[in-house]
């Protein structure tokens, strides 16, 4: 592989230059078709981009290209313009061209942006030489917004540039105005003035009226050393042009529009916020308005001017408040299509949006959040926060007024006090508790949608992770052993690394939760329990009396334990065991444990059926005896024996 | 401090699919928020993929979206991305992050 | 999708300088924004997030600020350790967008 061509771009600023065959041309000594010449950036321009013709210009920076494709001019260098001015700079490309199964060759391409060069896209060599409107017979400020020669001055190394300036020379005057500095006017004995001077503000085109002729002035502009001393650097000659109009020829610039806002069949004035143009030329009465479409929403009247719609109306009626949008029963926003003219220009076509407000909305909470107990958080929805009006509002916005007491809202893992709707469907907005000890939080939003606000509140709750026994049900006067059968914080136990524990809340109204002795020869009773934990349930140490309800026939009850569990690391959770009761039924198979059976029953315990379904012996050989308030291991043998 | 290690193949074939796990350690994947999965393009800028969150919902960049499934082992303390239909423009260097922390990233090349 | 602007896309600074890097989203984003440094051949750090928090173990040199569209990341005083790429990054809506970089070079 060889590489010939220069290897060096010239570019004028600001431009687009493609890269051609006397820059870049390689070739192989298979005589390889240039498709397969292949060029990879190594390392792009610092000062602009490489990008192809047939590809989107805006996209990613170009990583490879054909000998072919620069043959065919699709390899295009721009140069971005930098803030600063410069006179001249460079830049380089880094290159590897590559054919297998030849070696690859490093290439380097040596940009060089230049005011110097001849640029038919930007005739001027100065960073600015823009020209200037001047209405007809009136002055106007030449600033270096429209002609600035800094570029020039760029030239001269950083720490000697305080002591230069650009001297303009005027080698041919304005033939229909004249130009002062500092009020003085130029004159062919005086003909210069600085950069510094033009800079300051200090430099002055005034029209002499009579006329809209085209105007200008040429001049030469070079370096000029300290104390004035002529040095050598870039120079140019060029002109500058003066554009006068006519006192009403400028058109009517249109402002951005705000919407208008109101609620339904209510009046609003419109004010310049919504409809404003800039017209130095123009008196508000001479800028008119005419309505060419209109919104089935409502329509615009004119105070003083009657009841009904107005379709024609000046910026004076704006300016004064005197035009007003007045609103049907519609909820609909709507789109007024205006032209706009100050009688001189052609008219613009100008629009006004209308947005019809809610007069109320709702936040709908349709069930409190629930947080998972061991992940401690949860995603907010619209089952926790959904705004309506007249309809859905999915722009609404959200600010807490109330934070939560025991957790924070994050969004992106971020604490925020503020979130969208957006982020909510998103599944962005998550609660997380950070201080475990209360099963349940609040928090108060402020809720905006179109201009009207509501609050509410958002209850979080935590669901307990507890697999909780739902069998049949259990027999009255028994008690029943509370395993992991009945409940069971496994899993919460695993997920934590800790224990957890249980606390009776509340319940049940009819018995009671109780220590049972582990053995025979373990001396007392039951002792009724308040705490437990899961260890306590995977001993088998735990049983429930099952009561009777009382002042009622025997029959089917309901009954429920309410209870909070707590682990290490998570937020506390209540849960519920609900359970179903009835009379003991000797002959029913019952899916727990029974540690006793009722005492009236117990005739029967010699009998087969009397031993529990689940494998485990009756209450005669199992029984850890439990001195139960309604009979118990020692009255059975009591009863039995009187019997 | 929580940690993240990606690991899987550095080369990929055209057309195939690109399979990456990443490890925590230090702390548990049920902990985070957002387990994302983000790539850098040789000497560009960094495109987040996706993510798979605590509860185990995921959200990917709809420019990738018909191509990724990020998934994750809890018991593992793992989560992982797979890319199917790989071209050469998916040579990148592949982070994992939760944006706090991030792995110090793997070098794929998809290339026959 | 938000697009996420940086300007200046490179800078040369000095040590002792106070640099500003500006970051501009497509649309308002209220504060959510992170800043990551990342130097070469490494994974990025967090420095900043939610606009102008400092993120654990960050030097108090960093600063960040804005609100809406318009970001900014200020080192107060540059320090050789804190030439790399700087980079935003929008978490207000799906698709989390980054910035292009900006390259902070030793002048």
């Known amino acids: 592989l060889s590489l010939k061509g220069s290897q060096t771009l010239t570019v004028c600023p600001g431009s687009v230059q493609p890269l051609s065959s006397q820059t870049l041309r390689a070739s192989s000594s298979a005589g390889t078709d240039p498709q397969l010449l292949l060029y990879r950036v190594v390392r792009g321009p610092q000062l602009g981009r490489l990008f192809h013709a047939q590809q989107d210009s805006t996209g990613e920076a170009l990583v490879n290209f054909t000998q072919a494709e620069v043959y065919a001019g699709n390899i295009l260098y721009e140069h971005e313009m930098p803030p600063e001015p410069f006179w001249e700079a460079h830049d380089t490309l880094e290159l590897q061209l590559s054919s297998p199964p030849a070696r690859d060759v490093a290439a380097t391409l040596a940009v060089a942006v230049s005011f110097e060069a001849a640029c038919p896209q930007h005739p001027s060599h100065l960073w600015k030489n823009k020209g200037l409107w001047v209405p007809e017979g009136q002055r106007a400020r030449i600033t270096v917004a429209a002609l600035d020669a800094s570029n020039l001055l760029a030239s001269v190394p950083s720490p000697q540039r305080s002591e230069h300036d650009v001297l303009f020379q005027v080698t041919q005057f304005p033939s229909r105005g004249q130009l002062l500095v500092s009020e003085e006017p130029l004159h062919a004995g005086q003909p210069h003035f600085l950069q510094s001077q033009l800079a300051a503000g200090q430099l002055v085109y005034a029209h002499g009226g009579g006329g809209t002729q085209q105007d200008g002035f040429h001049f030469r502009a070079h370096l000029q050393g300290p104390a004035g001393a002529s040095v050598a650097g870039p120079q140019t000659s060029e002109a500058f042009a003066i554009t006068v109009r006519d006192v009403n020829e400028r058109p009517p610039q249109p402002q951005a529009s705000v919407p208008l806002r109101l609620t339904r069949g209510s009046r609003a004035p419109i004010s310049r916020a919504q409809l404003s143009v800039v017209d130095p030329d123009s008196a508000p009465g001479e800028i008119e308005y005419e309505v060419q479409r209109a919104p089935h929403n409502g329509f615009l009247s004119l105070v003083g001017g009657g009841l009904g719609p107005v379709t024609r109306f000046t910026q004076a009626d704006v300016d004064s408040g005197r035009l007003a949008f007045v609103a049907n029963g519609s909820s609909v926003a709507g789109i007024f299509q205006l032209s706009m003219s100050d009688g001189a220009s052609p008219p613009l076509p100008m629009s006004l949006a209308v947005d019809i407000l809610p007069s109320a909305i709702e936040v709908q909470l349709r069930a409190p959040l629930e947080v998972p107990q061991a992940l401690g958080r949860s995603s907010l929805s619209q089952q926790q926060l959904r705004v309506v009006s007249d309809r859905e509002e999915p722009e609404a916005a959200y600010r807490l007024i109330q934070g939560p007491q025991y957790g924070h809202l994050l969004v992106g893992g971020r604490p925020t006090s503020a979130f969208s709707q957006f982020q909510i469907d998103q599944g962005e907005v998550v609660f997380a508790f950070t201080n475990f000890s209360s099963s349940h939080d609040h928090f108060r939003v402020l809720a905006l949608a179109r201009g009207v606000n509501a609050s509410a509140v958002v209850n979080v709750t935590v669901r307990a992770l507890l697999h909780v026994w739902a069998g049949g049900p259990w027999p009255q006067g028994a008690t029943l052993r509370l395993d992991p059968t009945v409940l069971d914080a496994g899993e919460l136990a695993n997920r934590t690394g800790s224990v957890p524990r249980f606390r009776l809340l509340e319940g049940p109204r009819h018995g009671r939760v109780v220590r049972v002795p582990r053995a025979r020869t373990e001396p007392g009773g039951s002792q009724l329990v308040e705490q437990f934990t899961q260890q306590d349930l995977e001993d088998g140490r735990l049983g429930l009396e099952v009561g009777r309800p009382e002042g009622r026939a025997p029959g089917p009850a309901g009954d429920s334990l309410t209870l909070e569990l707590w682990a290490q690391g998570v937020p506390p959770a209540v849960a519920s065991l609900d359970f179903a009761t009835e009379p003991y039924n000797a002959a029913r198979p019952y899916s727990v444990a029974l540690l006793s059976v009722p005492e009236a029953a117990r005739t029967e315990a010699g009998k087969p059926e009397s031993s529990t379904p689940t494998g485990e012996p009756g209450p005669m050989a199992s029984s850890p005896e439990p001195a139960v308030a309604k009979g118990g291991f020692l009255s059975f043998l009591e009863a039995n024996m009187f019997s | 401090q929580v940690q993240l290690q990606e690991s899987g193949p550095g080369l990929v074939k055209p057309s195939q699919t690109l399979s990456l796990t990443c490890t925590v350690s230090?702390?548990?994947?049920?902990?985070?928020?957002?387990w994302n999965w983000i790539r850098q393009h040789p000497g560009k800028g960094l495109e987040w993929i996706g993510y798979i969150t605590f509860d185990g919902r995921n959200n990917y960049n709809p420019s990738l979206k018909s191509r990724v499934t990020i998934s994750r082992d809890t018991s593992k303390n793992q989560f992982s991305l797979k890319l199917s239909s790989v071209t050469a423009a998916d040579t990148a260097v592949y982070y994992c992050?939760?944006?706090?922390?991030w792995g110090q990233g793997t070098l794929v090349t998809v290339s026959s | 999708d938000i697009q996420m602007t940086q300007s200046p896309s490179s800078l040369s600074a000095s040590v002792g300088d106070r640099v500003t890097i500006t970051c501009r989203a497509s649309?308002?984003?209220?504060?959510?924004l992170n800043w990551y440094q990342q130097k070469p051949g490494k994974a990025p750090k967090l420095l900043i997030y939610?606009?102008?928090s400092l993120h654990s173990g960050v030097p108090s040199r960093f600063s960040g600020s804005g609100s809406g569209t318009d970001f900014t990341l200020t080192i107060s005083s540059l320090q050789p350790e804190d030439f790399a790429t700087y980079y935003c990054?929008?978490?207000?809506?799906?698709?989390?967008?980054f910035g292009q970089g900006t390259k902070v070079e030793i002048k």
């Open positions: 992050a939760d944006f706090d922390y």
């Open positions: 230090g702390g548990s994947i049920t902990d985070g928020y957002y």
């Open positions: 990054q929008q978490y207000s809506e799906l698709p989390w967008t």
């Open positions: 939610y606009t102008g």
């Open positions: 649309r308002g984003i209220r504060e959510y």
